[in-house]
Structure formats: C-alpha cells, structure tokens
C-alpha cells in the first residue's frame, strides 16, 4: 500500500522564497516519520529533511545547505525554502516515508512541483531613460 | 529596549546534563525565531540550534545533535536549551541570539552569554 | 558547508586609522553576509547585515561591501572604542557559519 502525493504542478518563488505545500492520503498525527524534498528529475538532490516524531517538535535539516523549515498538518507538511538562487529552478518532488507503526510506508512518486526562481530584476529609472533611437 | 539574559550555565561532569534559560524582553518574543550560538574560551563563534516562532519546528548543528533540544515558552517570553550527555568540547559562553522571521539566521540581538563548563 | 576565511587575522592600527578587513566565502553567498563587533567579555554587536546595510545605532564610520564571494567591512576612522574583534557570518546556506575572526588592537 502506498501514500498517494499531492503537490502544486508550478509554484513561483518571489523574493528567493517559496512555500510547497506536499498533501498525503494519509494522517501523520501521532505518528514517526520522515517528510522530505528532493530536487531534479532523478530526485537526486535532498533539499530538506522534515522528521516527525508523534506529536513532538519537528526536527529540520537539509545536507545540501538549503535554508529551509517545515510545518505540520494532520495529512501535510509545508516546506518553506529562503534563498533560493534563480538557476535553482528545478522540478521538486515531495517524499514521505511513515516509519511507526508497522508497517513501513512511502509514497507513490508524485508529479512534483516546477519551481520557477524569479530574479530581481532592476526596473531603468524614468530619470534616466536610455539612448534614444533617432 | 530588547534584553535577552542567559542563565543555568556551570560546572558539569562529562556525561551529565545541563538545562540553559534564556529570558526575553523589550519585544514581541513568539514573533521571533531564536538560536544558540556558543563560543568555546579563546575561540570563534559556532551556531548551535534554532526553534521558529511558534516552537513547532527546530534544527541543531551535527555536533550536537541527538544530545541537545531546544524549546521556547512564548507565555514567559523564554528560551530554553536541554543539554545531555555533555562533552569537554561543549565547554563554551552560550549566548542566545534573536532573528526574525523573515531572515532566520540574522542575529540583530544576543544576550550576554551563560559560562558552560564539562569538566571532572 | 560554507567557510568563511577572514583577514588579517589582526590588524594593528592606531586611532584616527582606516581599518579594511577582509571575508572570503568558499562559495557564493550573494549578499546574505553580516558583521558583528565583539569586545572581551562582552557579547556580539550586529554591525552589517546584508553584506552592506548598517543595523540601528551603528556610526556610519562602519561600512560594508561585497557580495558573491568577497566581503569587506571597512571602519573609516578608527576611534578608542572600535579595537575589538570582528566576526562575519553567512545566512545563504544552512548551516550558518561564523569566519574565524580578525582581532583589530591598537599598533
């Protein structure tokens, strides 16, 4: 039996933050998991790690220096990412494995989530309008 | 005027246990994320944990990790940092750090820093 | 994770001196780059923060640039109370990290 997955098909990170919201078929109140985000078609990059243990504090990491912190619902978690760099857009994929009780569950790989990293773009000041064509 | 003052630092045997308060004051505490950050006698600055506003959610460096959890009480405005399993190189003034919630790790205030000593 | 290496690791100076120190990342940290002031005894003072941006109650003596990689943090004239040692600190990447210091003493 697998979790089934959803996620936004495409998020835009204004101000080189996003919030990805990853909703499961499943209630993760009262139990031992490990919530995750990976990054790239091949999921090969583990963005940050969102481990939960019944009802107690969340414990955030990410080995692949991302900023990042995680929020909690009864079949959610929301994965907030700060500083993301432009050439970090990517497809991202939420993972979820529910370690206790037995049995051992994860989930069906999900369709993931085109985060698009949006630069800030200096706008020309009106005082200073460039050369003008004659 | 922000005030953050540390307490429950001492002397402590490796392997035994410490419990750090840190009191808040002058703003609005449950807005805030809070750190740790500890600084060993002679030595430079190393950041420790962190608990977000609503203390739901924490992290802690891989020196630490698995010996130390971090907590708040946002109704007494405190800090909290449950130290086990203490070590020689936990030796260090801890000093808890303020930072908001838009840019978790820039520490705009720090309190005045606790003395943890593990020695036998 | 992200090293940050300062330099000098001191920097002798005398009052009224310009003071130029020095924080190199080992990978971009954009601008995502503080500064803090720490006297003996005393606890940190956040200087900079965003690599160029002075926090409240800071001298405008006080001035920092960078970004990328390369940071300064520059004391335009150096008065009795700014020997002190320096520390920067990225926020770009987790876990934040601290440089190793650079300790400013009267020459």
């Known amino acids: 039996n697998k979790i089934l997955v959803k996620q936004s098909p495409m998020l835009v990170a204004y101000d080189n933050a996003v919030n990805l919201s990853c909703k499961y078929s499943y209630n993760l109140f009262s139990r031992e998991f490990r919530a995750s985000l990976h990054k790239g078609l091949d999921s090969a990059v583990e963005v940050c790690v969102v481990y939960g243990n019944y009802s107690q504090q969340l414990q955030v990491y990410s080995k692949t220096g991302f900023n990042c912190d995680g929020k909690l619902g009864n079949e959610s978690v929301t994965f907030y990412l700060q500083n993301l760099y432009v050439n970090q857009t990517d497809i991202y994929f939420c993972k979820i494995e529910v370690m206790y009780p037995p049995p051992y569950l994860d989930n069906e790989k999900s369709n993931g989530t085109i985060i698009h990293v949006k630069g800030k773009h200096l706008c020309p000041s009106p005082l200073f309008p460039g050369p003008s064509k004659p | 005027e922000v005030q953050l003052v540390e307490s429950g630092g001492g002397l402590v045997q490796p392997g035994g246990s410490l419990r750090l308060s840190c009191a808040a004051s002058?703003?609005?505490?449950?807005?805030?994320?809070m750190h740790w950050v500890r600084q060993a006698p002679g030595k430079g600055l190393v950041w420790v944990s962190r608990?977000?506003?609503?203390?739901?959610?924490?992290s802690f460096a891989d020196s630490v990790k698995g010996r130390f959890t971090i907590s708040r009480d946002n109704a007494k405005n405190t800090l909290y940092l449950q130290m086990n399993s203490l070590r020689a190189e936990d030796t260090a003034v801890y000093y808890c750090a303020r930072a908001d919630n838009s840019s978790w790790y820039h520490f705009d205030y720090w309190g005045q820093g606790t003395l943890v000593t593990v020695s036998s | 994770e992200i090293v940050l290496t300062q330099s000098p690791a001191t920097l002798s100076l005398s009052p009224g001196e310009r003071a130029t120190l020095s924080c190199r990342a080992s990978q971009s940290v954009s601008s995502y780059l503080a500064w803090y002031q720490q006297k003996p005894g005393q606890a940190p003072r956040l200087l900079i923060y965003?690599?160029?941006n002075r926090a409240t109650a800071i001298p405008a003596r006080f001035s920092g640039s960078g970004s990328g990689t390369d940071f300064t943090l520059t004391i335009s004239s150096l008065e009795p109370e700014d020997f002190a040692v320096y520390y920067c600190q990225q926020r770009r990447n987790w876990p934040p990290t601290f440089g190793q210091g650079t300790k400013v003493e009267i020459k």
């Open positions: 002058g703003f609005t505490f449950s807005s805030y994320w």
């Open positions: 965003d690599a160029s």
């Open positions: 608990v977000n506003s609503d203390g739901s959610s924490a």
